[in-house]
Interface confidence: medium
């Protein structure tokens, strides 16, 4: 398996580095975190991608003014966006 990887980037442009996963890794994971008030004010956005042995959380999580989306896939360089 190969996945794109990056850590706490502002844009997907900085998340296009292919990484060879370990045999232990079953998934490509994308974690997208943002903070703001509705659609009016955005405090920040962060994008991380990695190989992972498991899919951490199946759906988006909202905590107050922060939200986090996690998506998982299982094919070659599938976590492009």
């Amino acid at each position: 398996l190969m996945c794109f990887s990056c850590l706490n980037q502002k844009s997907n442009l900085y998340c296009l580095k292919p990484t060879i996963c370990s045999d232990q890794d079953n998934y490509c994971v994308t974690v997208s975190a943002s903070a703001g008030i509705g659609n009016l004010v955005t405090f920040g956005h962060s994008l991380s991608k990695t190989c992972s042995p498991a899919c951490p959380i199946p759906e988006g999580v909202n905590v107050g003014v922060a939200s986090m989306g996690i998506s998982c896939c299982q094919s070659f360089l599938c976590n492009f966006s």
Epitope: C21, S22, Q24, A54
Partner: antibody, heavy 123, light 106 residues
Framework: EVQLVESGGGLVQPGGSLKLSCAAS????????MHWVRQASGKGLEWVGR??????????YYADSVKGRFTISRDDSKSTVYLQMNSLKTEDTAVYYC??????????????WGQGTLVTVSS | DIQMTQSPSSLSASVGDRVTITCKAS??????VDWYQQKPGKAPKLLIY???NRYTGVPSRFSGSGSGTDFTFTISSLQPEDIATYYC????????FGQGTKVEIK
């Protein structure tokens, strides 16, 4: 505390069979892949094979040196992994270790090891 | 299969010395390399995972670096309790260990 305890080793004749067991405790056994690694006396470590978890259909993977002769299985209800060894050769003589990764802190490597069980193949 | 060529096969150093062991993979394995310590009659112990991450409880004198095909393991200041055999291992495709490096005290 994580514990892996191997058993079932012993003396067997060439061409014979032996089944090793590895009983695990201290972690959620059903969620991790389990591995077997062996070491001949005075030699280096050799990975034997591994079995993944139920969501990936207990997929197995073997070193070329044992493929077709060894079979790994697991019983999640007993937190035990097995290594069935058939058509044994003298070169299979080694200490056999079971090993498990530590997924809890993001380490997918061989973090946990058993004490090993000795398999001697000799006539 | 991927081969891991580890060198040297043995070394002798004094207490306090800096010790370096290298491992070369026969093809690109990314950062999927671990380092293990094994003392006689004991099971191996994980020291470094994913090329450069120290495992829980491992002293800071142990470190790892590298990616792709070339990897290095370093003991910054050798201690008497570090006498052991050290192995690299790749986990990119199946799993392959290096031949091991036996570290002794002068």
């Amino acid at each position: 505390e994580v514990q892996l305890v191997e058993s079932g080793g012993g003396l067997v004749q060439p061409g014979g069979s032996l089944k090793l067991s590895c009983a695990a405790s201290g972690f959620t056994f059903s969620t991790v892949a389990m591995h077997w690694v062996r070491q001949a006396s005075g030699k280096g470590l050799e990975w034997v094979g591994r079995i993944r978890t139920k969501p990936v259909n207990y997929e197995t993977y073997y070193a070329d040196s044992v493929k077709g002769r060894f079979t790994i299985s697991r019983d999640d209800s007993k937190s035990t992994v097995y290594l069935q060894m058939n058509s044994l050769k003298t070169e299979d003589t080694a200490v056999y270790y079971c090993s498990a990764p530590n997924y809890y802190d993001g380490t997918y490597s061989f973090a946990y090891w058993g004490q090993g069980t000795l398999v001697t193949v000799s006539s | 299969d991927i081969q891991m060529t580890q060198s040297p096969s043995s070394l002798s150093a004094s207490v306090g010395d800096r010790v370096t062991i290298t491992c070369k993979a026969s093809q690109n394995v990314g950062s999927n390399v671990d380092w293990y310590q094994q003392k006689p009659g004991k099971a191996p112990k994980l020291l470094i995972y994913k090329a450069s991450n120290r495992y829980t409880g491992v002293p800071s004198r142990f470190s790892g670096s590298g990616s792709g095909t070339d990897f290095t393991f370093t003991i910054s200041s050798l201690q008497p309790e570090d006498i052991a055999t050290y192995y690299c291992m790749q986990s990119s495709t199946k799993y392959t260990f290096g031949q091991g490096t036996k570290v002794e005290i002068k």
